[in-house]
């Protein structure tokens, strides 16, 4: 039985040329944490594997950087960063859990960033 | 230890396609990418595409999209690499090879002898 | 694309001899994330297929000989093997994995002399 849950920083925008930390963090479960992996829509940012470190994507190498943690920071922002953004966690003996986090990227010079929030 | 093993020699007539196979063992097929390399007669090497078994994430040589198809099933830890509308110039050996993130291709196939002629 | 420049195409070598080999890249492969260089050394025997020497531009690979080492960053590298050995006439690749589609060299055959 899956118990655990995925907290991640939700709903988030940040400027045109900036950077943002998109961050999430599994509670509620003692499942060991094989592999995270960082998706944007359907395409592969980066994977952290327990044991073999970082793997980020070569099409994203100019603008993702590791972490902190098993988190991922987005670089020179553009309007086109724009969207949804998973992490997924691959535990055992649990299983997968996934977590979203929207990203808007605005032209302005304010950016708030919104509430953080639970997926189950 | 460490082994990918690939399928047979093929002959091939133009226009045909070709299924080859990498049969992974020694390690968690699912950690690491699968690449595939081809290399001509007494050419160069020439990166096709890649898939990562684990998610099944794929990315492809714009040289070959649309003819090269990469497919991983990791009940066997088998992956395949299906090129199609063959032409002479395809005529190589097919290398797959694991790689992750910083390691670069630390294991290599034996290669897989492909010759395309009418 | 990254173009991957090789130089010299071919050499004449002896058994004993130092052998430098230069790879130039057409953009850096410095990733500033972990001040890595993401270029690899592979050798290349006739029939066989490549082997891995060197990755990160100057990490030797596991079981590999010391006499191979690698050096250089951001757009520029170099291969050198300290003393020939009999068994070290074959052809050498670099290769970038920084940014798809990843490419190699055209390669150095190293000859007997």
């Known amino acids: 039985m899956m118990t655990g849950t995925i907290e991640t920083t939700g709903n988030i925008s940040a400027e045109k040329g900036g950077s943002i930390i998109l961050q999430c963090h599994l509670s509620s479960t003692t499942a060991q944490v094989t592999q995270v992996n960082w998706e944007q829509q359907d395409q592969l940012l980066a994977i952290c594997n327990a044991d073999l470190g970082w793997h980020i994507s070569p099409s994203f190498k100019d603008r993702v950087a590791p972490g902190p943690g098993l988190g991922l920071t987005l670089q020179s922002l553009t309007v086109n960063d724009t969207g949804e953004y998973f992490c997924i966690y691959h535990t055992y003996p649990d299983g997968t859990y996934t977590g979203r986090i929207f990203l808007e990227v605005l032209e302005s010079s304010v950016a708030e960033h919104g509430a953080r929030f639970q997926i189950p | 230890q460490v082994q990918l093993v690939q399928s047979g020699a093929e002959v091939k007539k133009p226009g045909a396609s070709v299924k080859v196979s990498c049969k992974a063992s020694?390690?968690?097929?699912?950690?690491?990418?699968i690449l595939w390399i081809r290399q001509a007669p007494g050419q160069g090497l020439e990166w096709m595409g890649d898939?990562?078994?684990?998610?099944?994430?794929?990315n492809y040589n714009e040289k070959f999209q649309g003819r090269v198809t990469l497919t991983a099933d990791t009940s066997s830890s088998t992956a395949y690499m299906e090129l199609s509308s063959l032409r002479s110039e395809d005529t190589a050996v097919y290398y797959c090879?694991?790689?992750?993130?910083?390691?670069?291709?630390?294991?290599w196939g034996q290669g897989t002898l492909v010759t395309v002629s009418s | 694309d990254i173009q991957m420049t090789q130089s010299p195409s071919s050499l004449s070598a002896s058994v004993g001899d130092r052998v430098t080999i230069t790879c130039r890249s057409s953009?850096?492969?410095?990733?500033?994330?972990?001040?890595?260089?993401?270029l690899a050394w592979y050798q290349q025997k006739p029939g066989k297929a490549p082997k891995l020497l060197i990755y990160?531009?100057?990490t030797g690979e596991s079981g590999v000989p010391s006499r191979f080492s690698g050096s250089g960053s951001g757009t520029d590298f170099t291969l050198t093997i300290s003393s020939l050995q009999p068994e070290d006439f074959a052809t050498y690749y670099c290769?970038?994995?920084?940014?798809?589609?990843?490419?190699f060299g055209q390669g150095t055959k190293v000859e007997i002399k």
């Open positions: 953009q850096s492969l410095l990733y500033n994330s972990n001040q890595k260089n993401y």
């Open positions: 020694g390690y968690t097929f699912t950690n690491y990418w």
């Open positions: 090879t694991r790689y992750y993130g910083p390691y670069a291709m630390d294991y």
């Open positions: 290769q970038q994995y920084y940014s798809y589609p990843f490419t």
């Open positions: 898939i990562y078994p684990g998610g099944h994430y794929t």
């Open positions: 990160w531009a100057s």
